[in-house]
């Protein structure tokens, strides 16, 4: 029987920069029931805080609700664990709420051929930001970036469509089935989840010339 | 404890490229951003680039944008910072370092480093 | 870019003195700012961030005060460990960059 081994805080996300969560990995039991706190302060404070809420985000987790989230803040967290033997800490977690934001994916994704008379035809890619992101005070600026492959094709092609949200794809196969899908990053962040993929039937008169 | 080990100085001719390498240790590699910045003899320092080893997702210092290539493994938790086009003025000391949180760029581990040489 | 200006080059200062580096930047950068400190042949070593917060372990001798364009690392008495080169490095936009340095030597 030994004290509990080193935890480690491994993760941390936000939906929206509004709430948070940090996720941290137990070190070794040492072979007796342990109990984990995780306590944190913010830059410029001293005084240290206990997690507000260890349900929400599941075992081994601490949930930030509004209350408890501010941006532009820098929050020192680490985890103790502690069992009959002894206790140890986790190395000290700085986090800025600001770069932790994964979004859901975008939403209403549509996909289109366009055929015009005067052009070349093209496939055209159209979504819609996120529900939870308040793009309005521009707090926030997505990235995107779509994905598409012919239905049985191993390889995805990629495109970055930067801040907006619509896109233009020339060079398609004719009479392809294609799955189509977009993801969304904050300029500071990670990317969202793809996307539901949306199916295209590429009709075989579909010119690339 | 936090390790950021980094591969062997390197002696070069102008116009090819080297690759160093970054082995991390002590801590979950895919969630801290790594930076690659260098030291050029007795001056001082350039950040290069950064990548996010969660997805390999990068950014780069424009000077530097078509010679530059970071790249991370997660599999033997390794970042790597390929430059290509070397010429006399890339003799340097090439450093890793690793991001200090979850949080804006300041670097609060950083590798030993790897003195890469060109010369004719 | 934003340039960040380190004056002066080389201070020259007795262990137990107080010792106070500038560096200016070339725009506003608000408080994100980072200050290292580098002895001959090792890597640099992380003192401060957010321009005034010491990081884990840092003696309390070090500080930082300024926001904006102007900032200044004050060493309240410098110790024999203390002299070294310090850079400051500016991460409110990219490119990331740094200082050229101040050499605190002994005087």
């Known amino acids: 029987q030994l004290p509990p081994g080193k935890p480690e805080i491994f993760k941390c996300r936000s939906p929206n920069k509004e709430t948070f969560t940090c996720w941290w990995r137990p070190g070794t039991d040492g072979g007796l029931p342990t109990n984990y706190s995780l306590t944190y302060h913010r830059e410029g404070e001293t005084l240290m805080h206990e997690c507000p809420d260890y349900i929400t985000g599941g075992p081994n987790s601490c949930h930030f609700g509004k209350q408890y989230t501010s941006m532009w803040r820098t929050y020192i967290m680490m985890v103790n664990a502690t069992n009959q033997m002894g206790s140890s800490f986790s190395d000290e977690l700085y986090v800025d709420v600001t770069y932790i934001v994964q979004p859901d994916p975008p939403l209403e994704l549509a996909v289109e051929v366009k055929q015009p008379e005067d052009r070349k035809p093209y496939l055209w890619i159209k979504w819609s930001p996120p529900t939870l992101i308040d793009l309005k005070t521009g707090w926030f600026t997505l990235l995107y970036e779509i994905r598409l492959k012919p239905e049985k094709a191993a390889e995805w092609e990629i495109h970055f469509a930067g801040q907006q949200t619509e896109f233009k794809i020339l060079s398609l196969h004719p009479g392809q089935k294609y799955l189509v899908q977009v993801r969304c990053k904050p300029d500071h962040g990670y990317w969202s989840a793809w996307s539901p993929a949306t199916f295209i039937q590429i009709p075989s008169d579909f010119t690339m010339n | 404890q936090v390790q950021l080990v980094q591969s062997g100085a390197e002696v070069k001719k102008p116009g090819s490229s080297v690759k160093v390498s970054c082995k991390a240790s002590?801590?979950?590699?895919?969630?801290?951003?790594m930076h690659w910045v260098r030291q050029a003899p007795g001056q001082g320092l350039e950040w290069m680039g950064e990548i996010d080893p969660s997805d390999s997702y990068s950014n780069y210092n424009q000077k530097f944008k078509d010679r530059v290539t970071i790249t991370a493994d997660k599999s033997t938790s390794t970042a790597y910072m390929e430059l290509s086009s070397l010429r006399s003025e890339d003799t340097a000391v090439y450093y890793c370092?690793?991001?200090?949180?979850?949080?804006?760029?300041?670097?609060?581990?950083w590798g030993q480093g790897t003195l890469v040489t060109v010369s004719s | 870019e934003i340039v960040m200006t380190q004056s002066p080059a080389t201070l020259s200062v007795s262990p137990g003195e107080r010792a106070t580096l500038s560096c200016k930047a070339s725009q506003y950068v608000g408080t994100a700012v980072a200050w290292y400190q580098q002895k001959p042949g090792q890597s640099p070593r992380l003192l401060i961030y957010s321009a005034s917060n010491r990081y884990t372990g840092v003696p309390a001798r070090f500080s930082d005060s300024g926001s904006g364009t102007e900032f200044t690392l004050t060493i309240s008495s410098l110790q024999s460990e203390d002299f070294a080169v310090y850079f400051c490095q500016q991460y409110s936009s990219y490119p990331w960059t740094f200082g050229g340095g101040t050499k605190v030597e002994i005087k």
């Open positions: 370092a690793r991001n200090g949180g979850l949080g804006p760029a300041w670097f609060s581990y």
């Open positions: 002590g801590y979950t590699f895919t969630t801290y951003w």
